[in-house]
Interface confidence: low
């Protein structure tokens, strides 16, 4: 660390000056400012907020702040023809209708332009039929229904509870099962924590609260009409029939009061086991259809939403690097919200705003980072990560040559228990070292480091005395940078205690009740957790942009590669006979991992010893570190997922939110016992082992001495 604090007289400031400038009170003020009205993507309100942020970032001192606009496919309810679900009797009369909107929270009764709950990109339709309860609509839930219970969902409307996996995967699974409509609901078992009141008296979901969200299966494509390329003024757009990832059946979300009315009448099969029961006073019968007295009644969906090409706006701020202006460290988070965005995204956007202000203060006092820092306020994240993906598509050539790292900054909190970090293994040591320098905000850990409280509350399952750091999945704006472009990425936020709170996400996620007051009253009154997240995110950016040698440790990649190879091998070894029959060997992969480990070790030794005053050698070593993540990219992408190109990590094919290791091999092995052509299936396993082994070996060689 350098020894000078921030004045205008030296660029060699230490991180302390940057961190000391971050203030909880400012984050609180910014959060309030960003959450007073809705900022739905594609609306005038969100455009105005983009211009406000542009203006303020300029005031804060960034070198330039530009708006980058794209015309992308978005989805909105029809204002004059609302979406709802009915129970209809044998005469077709609607004897029950779900609510058309959430009761507004206190103080927000007169706010206009609150979008009613809807599933973005649902096609229009008015299907009617019998209901089937499909639990969480996970792959394994449909296996249970179809294979064990012999229940056919074809032609049925399915009702699934939110949680466990991304809602788009639920819809995809329902489509594959032949359903003609999907109803999504929030069960209190997942969205109502025991002993806590519902909003506005606590942070639980009231019965009228509903989770909005998109139901796309984009697999990293960005705008559904312009996959692979930016949705600019001269874009060629696909027809809607060829659009990527759109659902083919109507989908609509409801709250648990309305769900009670649908589920209480369910008949047919009993739930297969207790894991299918939620917390409502209903039998959780699977169906199909209603029980005896109500067997002639059906469920009818009324969905009238429209897909529209709409202009969106990213805000891109630049703080030019003094020494390596052609190396980019990016801090990005989205700005668009479903309604007020009290947590998602504005708790993150407020932190980004304060980080920009702190960097701007240092810059005004004469400091510059070694490398260029780009700050981004993304639009249309809620509609499929569209703003970040279109910008990355437009700038892909620059990013793949110049991108050092991407730090994501969506919601700063999803709880107030401990830190949660997902990142590339290259950043493990950076995160460990940084959190050792930061004070813990947790009660009972006064005077202790963040590392200490984090490790105590969220220990690593593999390494004692270390905290858990998870794999990157998707469902947020780092996706294009990491999964498509191979730029080292990370994210950090404060989270709940997963051991005692089994609900999915936080209860008020994507509802109208996600307000400033929710955060200020119940989650973080002192904004101390927000400040800590600002210090982690900002500290990571500072180090990545300012360290003479990039703070990446390639040896940590070696460790996880061995772990992932062991894991995928053990999955394959569940089929020992087939491995023998089809001559399936993992030797090439284990050999490549061994080579990677040895070469990474030697590289780390050279990194300690080389002459850091020689700018050419310094740049060469840093480039080897920067391009290591890039070396795991397969230009051909994963099977049927061309925009997921990282060979070591991809979003799970069964849950976009989760990361899967060696995804190509994993998917080839998944449910392989049910494949109609085992020879072909095991051939694909062998091909995927070959791709993985080659990629690991090729990545290792990028770390070898260049001559």
């Amino acid at each position: 660390k350098s020894s000078n604090e921030a004045t205008n007289i030296t660029p060699k400031h230490n991180m302390k000056a940057f961190l000391d400038e971050l203030k909880a009170e400012n984050i609180k003020k910014f959060l309030y400012n960003f959450t007073q009205i809705p900022h739905l993507a594609g609306t005038e309100q969100n455009f105005q907020l983009a211009k406000q942020i542009q203006s303020q970032w300029k005031e804060f001192g960034l070198d330039s702040v530009e708006l980058a606009h794209y015309d992308v496919l978005l989805s909105y309810p029809n204002k004059t023809h609302p979406n709802y679900i009915s129970i209809i009797n044998e005469d077709g009369n609607e004897i029950f209708n779900t609510s058309l909107f959430e009761p507004p929270p206190p103080g927000y009764e007169n706010v206009s332009d609150i979008v009613p709950p809807f599933s973005a990109f649902s096609p229009q339709g008015m299907p009617e039929g019998d209901l089937v309860y499909v639990n969480y609509a996970r792959t394994e839930d449909f296996f249970k229904l179809e294979r064990d219970m012999k229940i056919n969902c074809s032609g049925k409307i399915v009702i699934a509870r939110y949680g466990k996996v991304f809602r788009g995967n639920k819809v995809k699974n329902a489509q594959l099962a032949g359903a003609k409509g999907v109803i999504l609901y929030s069960d209190p078992a997942d969205y109502f924590a025991p002993g806590v009141k519902s909003y506005p008296d606590g942070w639980n979901l009231p019965g009228g609260g509903v989770q909005r969200g998109n139901i796309l299966n984009l697999n990293g494509a960005g705008d559904p009409l312009t996959p692979g390329y930016p949705a600019n003024e001269y874009a060629y757009r696909r027809g809607i029939a060829e659009a990527v990832g759109l659902p083919s059946i109507p989908v609509h979300p409801i709250g648990y009061y309305d769900a009670q009315k649908l589920l209480e009448k369910m008949g047919g099969s009993a739930p297969p086991d207790s894991s299918w029961r939620g917390s409502l006073k209903v039998p959780y019968n699977v169906g199909p259809g209603f029980t005896g007295n109500f067997s002639t009644q059906k469920v009818k969906m009324h969905i009238h939403s429209t897909n529209e090409v709409t202009r969106i706006y990213n805000v891109i701020g630049t703080l030019r690097g003094a020494v390596e202006p052609d190396r980019y460290v990016i801090l990005g988070g989205h700005r668009d919200s479903w309604v007020f965005g009290g947590i998602d995204p504005q708790s993150g956007a407020a932190v980004v705003h304060e980080i920009v202000r702190s960097f701007g203060t240092l810059k005004k006092e004469g400091w510059r980072p070694r490398r260029t820092i780009l700050f981004a306020s993304w639009d249309a994240e809620e509609f499929g990560l569209l703003g970040s993906t279109e910008w990355a598509e437009e700038n892909s050539r620059l990013l793949q040559e110049r991108g050092v790292a991407y730090i994501n900054a969506d919601s700063s909190i999803e709880g107030n228990y401990t830190l949660r970090v997902d990142c590339t293994p290259l950043m493990y040591s950076l995160v460990h070292n940084l959190t050792k320098e930061l004070k813990s905000p947790d009660e009972g850990f006064e005077g202790k480091s963040l590392y200490e409280s984090w490790t105590k509350k969220s220990p690593s399952p593999e390494f004692s005395g270390m905290p858990r750091i998870s794999k990157l999945g998707s469902g947020n704006d780092f996706e294009v940078f990491f999964q498509r472009l191979g730029i080292a990425s990370g994210r950090a936020r404060y989270t709940k205690n997963w051991e005692t709170n089994k609900f999915s996400g936080y209860p008020l996620y994507h509802s109208v009740y996600e307000t400033y007051e929710l955060v200020e009253k119940f989650y973080d009154p002192m904004f101390k957790y927000h400040l800590t997240v600002a210090q982690v995110r900002g500290g990571m950016v500072f180090e990545l942009a300012n360290s003479i040698v990039l703070p990446f440790d390639c040896r940590d990649y070696a460790v996880v590669l061995r772990k992932y190879a062991d894991k995928i091998y053990s999955i394959s070894m569940k089929h020992p006979q087939e491995m023998k029959t089809y001559s399936v060997s993992f030797d090439s992969l284990f050999s490549a991992v061994k080579n990677f480990t040895e070469i990474a070790s030697k590289f780390s030794e050279r990194l300690q010893d080389f002459d850091k005053s020689n700018p050419i050698v310094l740049r060469m070593m840093n480039d080897q570190l920067m391009f290591l993540e890039r070396a795991f990219i397969d230009p051909l992408g994963l099977p049927d997922r061309p925009f997921y190109r990282h060979v070591i990590y991809a979003p799970s094919s069964h849950n976009k939110y989760a990361g899967e290791s060696f995804p190509g091999i994993y998917d080839a092995l998944f449910d392989i016992e049910s494949k109609v052509d085992p020879s072909k299936a095991w051939g694909e396993v062998k091909r995927q082992i070959y791709v993985a082994a080659f990629t690991v070996q090729a990545a290792a060689e990028t770390l070898s001495e260049v001559a």
Epitope: E5, T7, N8, I9, T10, P11, A322, K364, G366, R368
Partner: antibody, heavy 117, light 107 residues
């Protein structure tokens, strides 16, 4: 109008003290680091001291360390330089200057300090 | 401390001439080099910052170049109001230091 106005210069005996002031107007004072730079008669420019926008960080040239103190009052938009144990070689025109992006992009008109017996 | 050496210390030139002043740092200062103009009895005025960036309001006949240790200020066509003393300054490390100045006089 964006400007800096120094005051407080004058004749002082060796070993004496003087306090210079610099009044800022037309910009958000607490956003900027501020500097004192001096110029001896017929000579070049010599940086003297700097203070961060919040006032929390200060730096001094070796030639004045321990004798001069830089400070600021952001509520009054004013920068100060307290000069003690003055020497003949401190004789110079003293300029206050605003620091932005590692440059001094706004200067006052200067105030003359003469140290002589 | 980083030493800044300007050359020449003075030069005579005519209106319309192309004038070049150089500044050399005793060690690499990246692009943290700034140029100032000072007229007799007046305060210095920033011309160029970060080696090559023209300060707002400064005529485009002034330009700067260089990085590392060697830097140049160029006046493409000298005007009567350009006769003054020019200083370079580094802000790469503490303390910031100025060059000795280059006085541009009328031939």
């Amino acid at each position: 109008e964006v400007q800096l106005l120094e005051s407080g210069g004058g004749l002082v005996q060796p070993g004496g003290s003087l306090r210079l002031s610099c009044a800022a107007s037309g910009f958000t004072f607490n956003n900027y680091a501020m500097n004192w730079v001096r110029q001896a008669p017929g000579k070049g420019l010599e940086w003297v001291s700097a203070i961060s926008g919040s006032g929390g960080t200060t730096h001094y040239a070796d030639s004045v360390k321990g004798r001069f103190t830089i400070s600021r009052d952001n509520s009054k938009n004013t920068l100060y330089l307290q000069m003690n144990s003055l020497r003949a070689e401190d004789t110079a025109v003293y300029y206050c200057a605003r620091g932005v992006a590692a440059t001094l992009n706004l200067w006052g008109q200067g105030t003359l300090v003469t140290v002589s017996s | 401390d980083i030493q800044m050496t300007q050359s020449p210390s003075s030069l005579s030139a005519s209106v319309g001439d192309r004038v070049t002043i150089t500044c050399r740092a005793s060690q690499s200062i990246s692009r943290y080099l700034h140029w100032y103009q000072q007229k007799p009895g007046k305060a210095p005025k920033l011309l160029i910052y970060d080696a090559s960036n023209l300060q707002s309001g400064v005529p485009s006949r002034f330009s700067g170049s260089g990085s590392g240790t060697d830097f140049t200020l160029t006046i493409s066509s000298l005007q009567p109001e350009d006769f003054a003393t020019y200083y370079c300054q580094q802000s790469y490390s503490n303390p910031p230091t100025f060059g000795g100045g280059t006085k541009v006089e009328i031939k």
